[in-house]
């Protein structure tokens, strides 16, 4: 798979492959994988990809199921790149405060917060 | 501050305190704090709170600015709790795939993805 494929297209394709290979993936009925309790997905990327690793090691490879796991590893690579961009740029306090305000505003409006 | 205050109310109050104390917070003109380049905020919580720690250590404490940092530490506590919930529950593959599908769906529609 060329890594030049836009991430958005990669995600769409991966969703389709996930549906296609569902039956094969659920073949192992005894397997247990951590599943986050909440829907703040970005907080859980590490655990999600650990789960994908567990699933891959238990799945018979071959054909387009390999493409599914290859795609998932490219998505992980993209997310790791985004995580790197969290701390690379040291800026003035002014900018940090504007970002913090944005972060809290997003928490206030978009996060799924339990009371 | 009672930790029983709902997180959503805590976030709102913190936003207000942030505006109130802006002038005091930007007093240190030489201070540099990492600011994420993108807007996928949840990926960057660790760096954001490290930045808050840096800012707190450089800010003259007293009055309601202390309340601001106390609030921020309670928000961090809430997020840490959410992160713990990422990996606590081990579920069947079916449930994991449902969550993975939801995660990719959210990535597809809500994440800020650079082309």
């Amino acid at each position: 798979i060329p890594t030049e494929i836009p991430t958005s297209a990669l995600v769409k394709e991966t969703l389709a492959l996930l549906s296609t290979h569902r039956t094969l993936l659920i073949a192992n009925e005894t397997l247990r994988i951590p599943v986050p309790v909440h829907k703040n997905h970005q907080l859980c990327t590490e655990e999600i990809f650990q789960g994908i690793g567990t699933l891959e090691s238990q799945t018979v490879q071959g054909g387009t199921v390999e493409r599914l796991f290859k795609n998932l590893s490219l998505i992980k690579k993209y997310i790791d790149g985004q995580k790197k961009k969290c701390g690379e740029e040291r800026r003035a306090v002014n900018q940090f405060l504007d970002y913090l305000q944005e972060f809290l505003g997003v928490m206030n409006t978009e996060w799924i917060i339990e009371s | 501050i009672p930790t029983e205050i709902p997180t959503s109310a805590l976030v709102k109050e913190t936003l207000a305190l942030l505006s109130t104390h802006r002038t005091l917070l930007i007093a240190n003109e030489t201070l540099r704090i990492p600011v994420p380049v993108h807007k996928n905020h949840q990926l960057c919580t660790e760096e954001i709170f490290q930045g808050i720690g840096t800012l707190e250590s450089q800010t003259v404490q007293g009055g309601t600015v202390e309340r601001l940092f106390k609030n921020l530490s309670l928000i961090k506590k809430y997020i840490d709790g959410q992160k713990k919930k990422c990996g606590e529950e081990r579920r069947a593959v079916n449930q994991f795939l449902d969550y993975l599908q939801e995660f990719l769906g959210v990535m597809n529609t809500e994440w800020i993805i650079e082309s």
């Epitope: 961009k85 040291r90 800026r91 003035a92 002014n94 900018q95 504007d98 970002y99 305000q101 944005e102 505003g105 997003v106 | 003109e29 030489t30 540099r32 600011v35 994420p36 380049v37 993108h38 807007k39 800020i112």
Partner: antibody
Framework: QVQLVQSGAEVKKPGASVKVSCKAS????????INWVRQAPGQGLEWIGY????????RYNQKFKGRATLTVDKSTSTAYMELSSLRSEDTAVYYC????????????WGQGTLVTVSS | DIQMTQSPSSLSASVGDRVTITCKAS??????LSWIQQKPGKAPKTLIH???RLIDGVPSRFSGSGSGQDFTLTISSLQPEDFATYYC?????????FGQGTKVEIK
């Protein structure tokens, strides 16, 4: 492709207000801040302020605070810069420019809008 | 506010010449500086960001260097299309400020 298209030239009388628009296309509008910069005839560039379409938060150069108002309409992916109490020295070309990332360089510029203030 | 002092304010050069423009910040701006080109009657165009990072599509004859307070834009071999005014911009802190510009003219 990514584009910022600005509204046409305006002629205003001193004391009046002007509202310049900047329509974004080719990218997700809320992902990038929009900055406003002006250039008086034969002069250099001057930063007016920025608006974050993600949360409607705006920040101004102190010189323009109280006179400039930055807004966005997310439904049409359009940013606006309104300048009130116009005086002759506000005659300038006004540009909108997109931040590449949070508080980063301006990677895309609008074509500019000439605002002439004359009695 | 951070002052950006650019020099020279204008220069005359010939095609093929190596041209250097400098920009000095009144305080440390790390490397948060970009170089902008503007041709008469046209919108500005950013050439370099973060002091030395060339933007995609910009010819490699343009290069930037410096950090802290002193920065340089170099055009290694001036081309006819490079005759324009060049500005530095600090985006380290608010308000963002520009240098006063350097006009590059044909000798």
């Amino acid at each position: 492709q990514v584009q910022l298209v600005q509204s046409g030239a305006e002629v205003k009388k001193p004391g009046a207000s002007v509202k310049v628009s900047c329509k974004a296309s080719g990218y997700t509008f809320t992902n990038h801040h929009i900055n406003w910069v002006r250039q008086a005839p034969g002069q250099g560039l001057e930063w007016i302020g920025y608006i974050n379409p993600y949360n409607d938060y705006s920040r101004y150069n102190q010189k323009f605070k109280g006179r400039a108002t930055l807004t966005v309409d997310k439904s049409t992916s359009t940013a606006y810069m309104e300048l009130s109490s116009l005086r002759s020295e506000d005659t300038a070309v006004y540009y909108c420019a997109r931040d590449y990332g949070n508080f980063w360089y301006f990677d895309v510029w609008g074509q500019g809008t000439l605002v002439t203030v004359s009695s | 506010d951070i002052q950006m002092t650019q020099s020279p304010s204008s220069l005359s050069a010939s095609v093929g010449d190596r041209v250097t423009i400098t920009c000095k910040a009144s305080q440390d701006i790390n490397s948060y500086l970009s170089w902008i080109q503007q041709k008469p009657g046209k919108a500005p165009k950013t050439l370099i960001h973060r002091a030395d990072r060339l933007i995609d599509g910009v010819p490699s004859r343009f290069s930037g260097s410096g950090s802290g307070q002193d920065f340089t834009l170099t055009i290694s071999s001036l081309q006819p299309e490079d005759f324009a005014t060049y500005y530095c911009l600090q985006y380290d802190d608010f308000p963002y400020t520009f240098g006063q510009g350097t006009k590059v003219e044909i000798k």
